[in-house]
């Protein structure tokens, strides 16, 4: 029995003076305690608690129930402990079957003996089932066995308590062991759509999927830089013992522009923190933006081809396009299709091909596009290069030559005399009188030029040439004269390709 | 680190008795248990009987079971066994085992101990 100094209280003293008794079944369990400010007996068993305000706590037959420790308290607080064993070889065991285990972390199956003397007190599996190699234990026959370090392959493991009477195995009710999964790494948080873009009044939905050992983990939505509480509805499942996914939805049933800005989805476990954002934004009405991917002047070569390209952002959806040229939709020679098959695209490309173009093919050329919103368009001027033609070559009236032709870019017109029978014209002549004329074909036709010479210049028979010429190439026209005594006469103009 | 040390072995008389000892030095706790194994020459190392650091409770093989009994004394780091009745085919090298870790599942798996002491021989004549 404990012994204080005089003077300070305390702890009652117990009757039988022992930590532990046993007694049989049925015998009297009689405990006495003896203090002066006595206040209350408290029976404590497994979940299981009585209280007596007598000093003397009888129990006439003794049941295997009264088995646990019987603490006598004064009014100081202090209180003194016996633990009663009432060993009854028909119970050997009392039972609490719940049975929950923290991985890593011990837990107690709470199997107290009636008779703390027997032996190869221990655990068994069920229906001679094997328990795990690894699992250990610590025995204490007032509360039952401690597994040591929980695992996470222990849970749903069916096991007994069990101990050695007369040289056979006595086995407890049965206990399932339910593991609570211990958080080892950060929750998976992953986002239906990384980003939104929708117009004022309509719904924004944005899912975002938790994933973890167990239904403890904490998720919430939260808007950056904003304390405001979101509203969110949650969907839950567990996929087998240790796979727990939860659907955490947000809602804004109609968005406006103000709403815009990042979303964020955070989760956490007591491992650490794991978190995903989405990013809506919301414009007032619909847009088409279009960015051409060539110079929109083009310049091509005769009977080339080129490739009007043009990449367009368009919110909602583009309805319709179309290319046009000279008011005429082009039916074919074009595709149309999306930058991204990802869900939240709204960048497109359109490509119009245009093949073996001709001189006469030069022109604008517009893409339109529209969505339930918006009309844009987009103007590509394109120029077709082409090598001169001599339209007209002749001999006026007023004895002037005069040579017209037409090219794109505008062609450049020299003239040449060469005397007698030589073909090479080297000596040049300047013209009297040069003229841009104005075509009448479109405006990105090809460009006329006129040059005249006075041929009273010329006193020998010979030949004089007109050369028209520009960046693609040059062709030339020629002019025999001979002189019969004092006339001077035109032979036969002819023109000669020069390549 | 434990360190095991056996004492107690010797030629005892069938019927005789034998007390053996394994004191233990290093940290023991709440966790550990302490076990006597046996092995005869030509056989596997087989479990005789363990305790409890922390209760007290013991465990026994089937074939000692009522002659011999385990105890421990806390203070002096010691476990005894008590070999009563002993027979013929009791005779083998005792080994003292330990292990921090709590009792095993299957505490007669020599296989599950950490520790281990050098053994006694005790030899039982007819």
């Known amino acids: 029995q404990p012994s204080v100094s005089p003077g300070e209280p305390s702890p009652p003293s117990i009757h039988p003076g022992k930590s532990d008794l046993i007694v049989r079944v049925g015998d009297e369990i009689r405990l006495l305690c003896t203090d002066p400010g006595f206040v209350k007996w408290t029976f404590e068993i497994l979940d299981e608690t009585n209280e007596n305000k007598q000093n003397e706590w009888i129990t006439e037959k003794a049941e295997a129930t009264n088995t646990g420790k019987y603490t006598c308290t004064n009014k100081h607080g202090l209180s003194n402990s016996i633990y009663v064993f009432v060993r009854d070889p028909a119970k050997l065991f009392l039972v609490d079957r719940s049975l929950y285990g923290k991985e890593d972390n011990d837990t107690l199956v709470r199997c107290p003996l009636t008779d703390p003397e027997v032996t190869n007190y221990s655990l068994k599996g069920c229906q001679g089932k094997p328990l795990p190699k690894d699992l250990r234990f610590i025995p204490d026959p007032k509360a039952g066995i401690m597994i040591k370090s929980v695992k996470r392959a222990y849970h749903r493991l069916c096991l007994h308590c069990s101990v050695d009477q007369e040289g056979k195995s006595v086995l407890s009710e049965k206990f399932i062991l339910k593991v609570r999964p211990a958080f080892k790494a950060v929750p998976v948080v992953s986002v239906s759509k990384a980003s939104y873009l929708l117009r004022e009044g309509e719904e924004f939905t944005v899912t975002c999927t938790i994933k973890d050992v167990s239904s403890s983990v904490y998720s919430t939505w939260k808007r950056e830089n904003s304390q405001t509480k979101l509203q969110e509805k949650y969907n839950s499942w567990h996929h087998g013992d240790f796979n727990y996914e939860r659907q955490a939805t947000l809602t804004i049933s109609s968005a406006r522009v103000n709403d815009s800005g990042v979303f964020m989805c955070y989760a956490n476990n007591t491992f650490g923190s794991a978190n995903v954002t989405t990013t809506l934004e919301v414009v007032d009405k619909g847009f088409i933006n279009i960015f051409p991917m060539i110079n929109t002047t083009v310049f091509v070569n005769d009977g080339e081809n080129v490739d009007l390209i043009v990449e367009y952002e368009a919110f909602p959806k583009p309805e319709h396009q179309q290319w046009i040229y000279m008011n005429r939709t082009f039916t074919d020679k074009w595709e149309d299709y999306p930058k991204s098959e990802n869900e939240s695209n709204i960048r497109y490309v359109s490509e119009l091909h245009l093949t073996r173009l001709k001189g006469t093919e030069g022109g604008t050329y517009t893409f339109l596009v529209s969505n339930s919103d918006v009309n844009a368009a987009i103007a590509f001027n394109v120029y077709v290069n082409t090598k001169p033609e001599i339209l007209t070559y002749d001999r006026l009236v007023n004895g002037m030559l005069q040579c017209v032709a037409a090219g794109f870019p505008e062609p450049t017109i020299d003239w040449y005399f060469c005397p007698g029978t030589e073909q090479r014209c080297s000596a040049s002549v300047l013209p009297v009188d040069v003229q841009t004329l104005n075509s009448s074909g479109p405006p990105f036709g090809k460009l006329v030029v006129q040059s005249s010479i006075d041929s009273s210049a010329f006193k020998h028979n010979g030949t004089v040439e007109c050369k028209a010429y520009n960046d693609v190439g040059k062709t030339s026209a020629y002019f025999n004269f001979a002189f019969k005594g004092n006339n001077k006469e035109q032979i036969h103009p002819h023109t000669l390709f020069t390549p | 680190e434990v360190q095991l040390v056996e004492s107690g072995g010797g030629l005892v008389q069938a019927g005789g008795s034998l007390r053996l000892s394994c004191a233990a030095s290093?940290?023991?706790?709440?966790?550990?248990?302490m076990g006597w194994f046996r092995q005869a020459p030509g056989k596997e190392r087989e479990f005789v009987a363990a305790?409890?650091?922390?209760?007290?409770?013991?465990y026994y093989a089937d074939s000692v079971k009522g002659r011999f009994t385990i105890s421990r004394d806390n203070a002096k780091n010691t476990v005894y066994l008590q070999m009563n009745s002993l027979k013929p085919e009791d005779t083998a090298v005792y080994y003292c085992?330990?292990?921090?870790?709590?009792?095993?599942?299957?505490?007669?798996?020599?296989?599950?101990?950490?520790?281990w002491g050098q053994g006694t021989q005790v030899t039982v004549s007819s």
């Open positions: 290093g940290r023991t706790s709440g966790s550990y248990v």
């Open positions: 085992a330990a292990d921090q870790r709590g009792v095993p599942a299957y505490y007669s798996d020599y296989a599950l101990y950490d520790y």
């Open positions: 305790i409890s650091w922390s209760a007290g409770m013991t």
